[in-house]
């Protein structure tokens, strides 16, 4: 179970506002985080940028099998894992793994999911059990999000867990009955 990766493509992207941008549920109450007046770095930094959309982060493509109990998808699904530091797009190297190429002296930026898509998946079950049809929510694109000192530890922790899909053994965040669970329309992927 878990990540069944036979493909791990890394591409540098500059996130833009798409048709269905969706902030992570736990961040939706902070409406001002992406505004220009809250973005960028202190004026003394030589590379000042006003807009978070000028920042870029890495999209890692992973393939995995979807499971439901003993049943597994006939084919793997491909989704993104949002990875790495965020920095001004013009400074972001194309090669991966060049160490600490840029360090902001001001606020921290994290690479987090931006848009999601839903995909219908057919699961095959052992022992002659009927196949199951399920839908999964997959990360479709990533974006840079500015963190400030006002973010508490739990939110920082959530950024870390947003970057990877919940695994068996780790409690995923359910949306059940959560006021923060406001779901923007998902991209239709099938």
């Amino acid at each position: 179970q878990g990540w069944q990766a036979f493909k791990n493509d890394a591409t540098e992207i500059i996130p833009e506002l798409g048709e269905y941008p969706e902030p992570p549920p736990e961040l939706e109450n902070n409406k001002t985080m992406n505004r220009a007046e809250n973005g960028g770095r202190p004026p003394h930094h030589p590379f000042e940028t006003k807009d978070v959309s000028e920042y870029s982060c890495r999209e890692l493509h992973f393939t995995r099998y979807v499971t439901d109990g003993p049943c597994r998808s006939a084919k793997p699904v491909t989704e993104l894992v949002c990875s790495g530091q965020c920095g001004p797009a013009r400074l972001l190297p194309n090669a991966i793994g060049r160490g600490k190429w840029w360090r902001p002296s001001g606020p921290d930026f994290r690479c987090i999911p931006d848009r999601y898509r839903a995909q219908r998946v057919q699961l095959l079950c052992p022992g002659g059990e009927a196949p199951r049809a399920r839908k999964v929510r997959l990360v479709a694109s990533c974006k840079c999000k500015r963190l400030t000192r006002f973010h508490n530890q739990s939110e920082l922790k959530d950024f870390g867990t947003e970057a990877a899909r919940p695994q068996k053994g780790r409690k995923p965040r359910p949306r059940a009955r959560s006021a923060k669970a406001n779901q923007a329309e998902l991209e239709n992927a099938y």
Epitope: G69, A118, A133, K135, R137, P166, R170
Partner: antibody
Framework: EVQLRQSGADLVKPGASVKLSCTAS????????IHWVKQRPEQGLEWIGR????????TYVPKFQGKATITADTSSNTAYLQLRSLTSEDTAIYYC???????????????WGQGTSVTVSS | EIVLTQSPALMAASPGEKVTITCSVS???????LHWSQQKSGTSPKLWIY???NLASGVPVRFSGSGSGTSYSLTISSMEAEDAATYYC????????FGSGTKLELK
Amino acid sequence: EVQLRQSGADLVKPGASVKLSCTASGFNIKDYYIHWVKQRPEQGLEWIGRIDPDNGESTYVPKFQGKATITADTSSNTAYLQLRSLTSEDTAIYYCGREGLDYGDYYAVDYWGQGTSVTVSS
Amino acid sequence: EIVLTQSPALMAASPGEKVTITCSVSSSISSSNLHWSQQKSGTSPKLWIYGTSNLASGVPVRFSGSGSGTSYSLTISSMEAEDAATYYCQQWTTTYTFGSGTKLELK
């Protein structure tokens, strides 16, 4: 906020049909399965079936095959349950629910509508 | 069809008391397919525990769930007045089936 808003209570005559609606807000029904459940007075919950609004494909419990028809209109973000040839046995509260998407290989109905009461009486 | 049998059907507990509700499944299922809902009189059900042991958002930590195969349970470590409700176990494999419910009252 994710919400499922169901149509109001219905009083119908035996033999008639009724069509209940379930309008979603805060999410696109095309991306989820919508389930319908029946609860008779002072009794438990009984699954009727579900629909994939994206392609209109529906699944039913054998007991409700022929009795219930589940449809959806994605343009209005609404799912429907039609019940035909009503008898007193169909007097119940009917709930629609959304099957939550995959969060670590768990699938369950994570949001329910407020329910629609159907009373079959002459 | 998978049949879920809950026991007891009705029980009363005093504040602070430990409560355990059991759910027996007619044939073995994966623990990820067993869920619990809470329903209070006149309201719709609420997902309470999913995948046997994961608390849904907003559920107090005094609730817990456990089990595997054909035997599952929901436990309240210390009963509180707001916990009085009917609890249903449910399984979602190829069909959704519910237990008959356990009505928990405050003593």
